[in-house]
Interface confidence: medium
């Protein structure tokens, strides 16, 4: 017979014939023949395969190394890899999250635009006119200058991006 040149979905070509792939969570033990079907076996305790496959070995689950600041966010199954994330105050250095670094702090004159997560660093922004930040922080946003007028006070010292305005009493007009 004319052998197939392409196989259907969830099949693979071998010896000019199509065999069924192994389902996610199982590895290939032996290819099918005319008399025997594809033989697959479940992945072991700390292993996985996440696609229909013909792999003879399962992949090892990722190890979330605490020495690198990592912890398990989601335990792996036979069909999914372990997902690591970083300990509190740290974030991943890459999409694969192979190691962590301490969240960046925003220097005085800069405020937090976006607080860091386990996978993204702190995003800082310069404090615009009318706002300031006088601390180095991974959480603090730029604060608005104090409004002296609403307190019936006057500006005695102008604010900067690092300092608040200083308010003082209004000069009394003499009679």
């Amino acid at each position: 017979p004319e052998p197939p040149t392409a196989c259907r979905e969830k099949q693979y070509l071998i010896n000019s014939q199509c065999c069924s792939l192994c389902q996610p969570g199982q590895k290939l033990v032996s290819d099918c023949t005319e008399f025997t079907e594809t033989e697959c076996l479940p992945c072991g305790e700390s292993e996985f395969l996440d696609t229909w496959n013909r792999e003879t070995h399962c992949h090892q689950h990722k190890y979330c190394d605490p020495n690198l600041g990592l912890r398990v966010q989601q335990k792996g199954t036979s069909e999914t890899d372990t997902i690591c994330t970083c300990e509190e105050g740290w974030h991943c250095t890459s999409e694969a999250c192979e190691s962590c670094v301490l969240h960046r702090s925003c220097s005085p004159g800069f405020g937090v635009k976006q607080i860091a997560t386990g996978v993204s660093d702190t995003i800082c922004e310069p404090c615009p006119v009318g706002f300031f930040s006088n601390v180095s922080s991974a959480f603090e946003k730029c604060h608005p200058w104090t409004s002296c007028e609403t307190k019936d006070l006057v500006v005695q010292q102008a604010g900067t991006n690092k300092t608040d305005v200083v308010c003082g009493p209004q000069d009394r007009l003499r009679a």
């Epitope: 017979p1 197939p4 014939q17 199509c18 069924s20 192994c22 025997t36 594809t38």
Partner: antibody, heavy 125, light 112 residues
Framework: QVQLVESGGGVVQPGRSLRLSCAAS????????MHWVRQAPGKGLEWVAV????????YYADSVKGRFTIYRDNSKNTLYLQMNSLRAEDTAVYYC??????????????????WGQGTTVTVSS | DIVMTQSPLSLPVTPGEPASISCRSS???????????LDWYLQKPGQSPQLLIY???NRASGVPDRFSGSGSGTDFTLKISRVEAEDVGIYYC?????????FGQGTKVEIK
Amino acid sequence: QVQLVESGGGVVQPGRSLRLSCAASGFTFSSYAMHWVRQAPGKGLEWVAVISYDGSNKYYADSVKGRFTIYRDNSKNTLYLQMNSLRAEDTAVYYCARRGHYGNNYYSYYGLDVWGQGTTVTVSS
Amino acid sequence: DIVMTQSPLSLPVTPGEPASISCRSSQSLLPGNGYNYLDWYLQKPGQSPQLLIYLGSNRASGVPDRFSGSGSGTDFTLKISRVEAEDVGIYYCMQALQTPRTFGQGTKVEIK
């Protein structure tokens, strides 16, 4: 139409031989693996043997291994079962059956989709 | 060898009523490729067996849709949604995972 016709059955004494034939028509015989299945009087179905589409691979039930030989002649569209050293317990209706497959992928499996009408073998002294 | 066990061995039915036959295998017929290697065959009185269901749940060509196969691993069921008089005969399950192929003992379906 697709058809399998067995022949060669009969009454035979224990220890003697018999050859069964299965003539195929209506399909490309050389593309299909073929099975022999038997049924003793009043009993269920028992698988006997299978041969690959090209005759290169053969498997047998333990009960017939070493006594029966399955073979085929694709030029004659015919399957055979050579039965030697016959025993009383080989008495049965013998059916040939086609192993169905998808398109031209003869590794795929679609059941034993065509059966012959059967031929009766009686082993008795 | 894989042992196939059917139940019941005899099933009296009423035309128009549903019927169900169970088949159990001594080992899983799901080798990890997503298919269950279990067939159902019907042998009508005085006839050769005929294929009803292959790979657990696929109806063979020309088989009425009142027949359905289900199950996975080691436990399988053949259901007839509404039995007709022509459905009488002996039903066999067969494992197609490995040689030797093995059949269940058969379930005799007869009209009450």
